[in-house]
C-alpha cells in the first residue's frame, strides 16, 4: 500500500493531527523534498551574517 | 462569538512607522495563525505576512522583508502588526484575519479593518 | 512576485452562472490544494466563500462552488442573485518567500 503521506508535495508536510493531510509549512520553517512528516525550522541569519536568501516554504534560508 | 477588534485610524507621516493592534477573542487564541493583509484605496488585497501566535514565529512577504514586525501578547490575547519607514504607498486599510484551525489555506474570520493614511 | 491572475471584471444576469478564472504557476495554484476564495462588499472586510480549492464554510451558500485544472483554479456562482454582486479574490499557498498571494480582484456585476 501507498503511504498517503507520499503524496505531500514539498513546502507541505503530512499532518499526523489531521488525519495524514498535506499541511502547509508553518511559519519561519520549510520543507524541500515531499513526503516529510515535519518542516524544518528556517535558518536564521544572525550577526557579522547577512541574508542572501529568503527561507521559501520549499528551501532554507542562505546566508 | 469570534471576533477580531483591530485598532482605530492613524495619520502618519512620511518616514514614520506605525503600529496596529488585534485583539482576538471568543477562541483559544494560541491554536490559531494570524494573517495581515492590506488593501490600498481602490486596490486588491495584499499578503503582508503570518505569526503564530503560540511559538510568535512569523514569516513576511519578499515585499515588506525589513519593514514589518509582527508581535503577539498571549496575556491580552492580541497581535501586533508594525510598518516603519513608511511612504506614501502604505497608505492602505489593514486587516488582521485568523487563519483556519492550526494552520490552513484559508482565514475565516475578519478584523473590521485599520485605515492608515501616510501624508506629509 | 506578482499577483495571481483573475479576470477584471464578470457579469451575469439573475439567476445565470457565471465563472471567475485564478490563473497561477506550478508553485503556486498548480502546485498545492490550498486555494481559497473570498467575497467582498465595498467598505467591508473580506469573507471566505472556498478553501482548499472546493470546501465551502458553513454558512456559505452552496451556489457558490470551486474546483482546479493545472494551475487555474476557479470559482462558479450559479443561480446569481443580486447580492452577489462583489468583488472576488483568489488566494493560494507558494512555494516562495511570500507564502501566500491574492489575485488581482474580479468585479462581478448582477445586470
Known amino acids: 500500500l501507498q503511504d498517503p503521506c507520499s503524496n505531500c508535495p514539498a513546502g507541505t508536510f503530512c499532518d499526523n493531527n489531521r488525519n495524514q493531510i498535506c499541511s502547509p509549512c508553518p511559519p519561519n520553517s520549510f520543507s524541500s523534498a515531499g513526503g516529510q512528516r515535519t518542516c524544518d525550522i528556517c535558518r536564521q541569519c544572525k550577526g557579522v551574517f547577512r541574508t542572501r536568501k529568503e527561507c521559501s516554504s520549499t528551501s532554507n534560508a542562505e546566508c | 462569538e469570534v471576533q477580531l477588534v483591530q485598532s482605530g485610524a492613524e495619520v502618519k507621516k512620511p518616514g514614520a512607522s506605525v503600529k496596529v493592534s488585534c485583539k482576538a477573542s471568543?477562541?483559544?487564541?494560541?491554536?490559531?495563525?494570524t494573517h495581515w493583509v492590506r488593501q490600498a484605496p481602490g486596490q486588491g488585497l495584499e499578503w503582508m505576512g503570518i505569526?503564530?501566535?503560540?511559538?510568535?514565529?512569523?514569516s513576511y512577504a519578499q515585499k515588506f522583508q525589513g519593514r514589518v514586525t509582527m508581535t503577539r501578547d498571549t496575556s491580552t490575547s492580541t497581535v501586533y502588526m508594525e510598518l516603519s519607514s513608511l511612504r506614501s504607498e502604505d497608505t492602505a486599510v489593514y486587516y488582521c484575519?485568523?487563519?483556519?484551525?492550526?494552520?490552513?489555506?484559508?482565514?475565516?474570520?475578519w478584523g473590521q479593518g485599520t485605515m492608515v493614511t501616510v501624508s506629509s | 512576485q506578482s499577483a495571481l491572475t483573475q479576470p477584471a471584471s464578470v457579469s451575469g444576469s439573475p439567476g445565470q452562472s457565471i465563472t471567475i478564472s485564478c490563473t497561477g504557476t506550478?508553485?503556486?495554484?498548480?502546485?498545492?490544494?490550498?486555494v481559497s476564495w473570498y467575497q467582498q462588499h465595498p467598505g467591508k472586510a473580506p469573507k471566505l466563500m472556498i478553501y482548499?480549492?472546493?470546501k465551502r464554510p458553513s454558512g456559505v451558500s452552496t451556489r457558490f462552488s470551486g474546483s482546479k485544472s493545472g494551475n487555474t483554479a476557479s470559482l462558479t456562482i450559479s443561480g446569481l442573485q443580486a447580492e452577489d454582486e462583489a468583488d472576488y479574490y483568489c488566494?493560494?499557498?507558494?512555494?516562495?518567500?511570500?507564502?501566500?498571494?491574492f489575485g488581482g480582484g474580479t468585479k462581478v456585476t448582477v445586470l
Open positions: 484575519a485568523r487563519g483556519a484551525p492550526e494552520y490552513s489555506s484559508s482565514s475565516d474570520y
Open positions: 471568543g477562541y483559544t487564541f494560541t491554536s490559531y495563525y
Open positions: 505569526i503564530n501566535p503560540s511559538g510568535g514565529s512569523t
Open positions: 506550478s508553485s503556486d495554484v498548480g502546485g498545492y490544494n490550498f
Open positions: 482548499d480549492v472546493s
Open positions: 488566494n493560494s499557498y507558494t512555494t516562495s518567500s511570500t507564502r501566500w498571494m
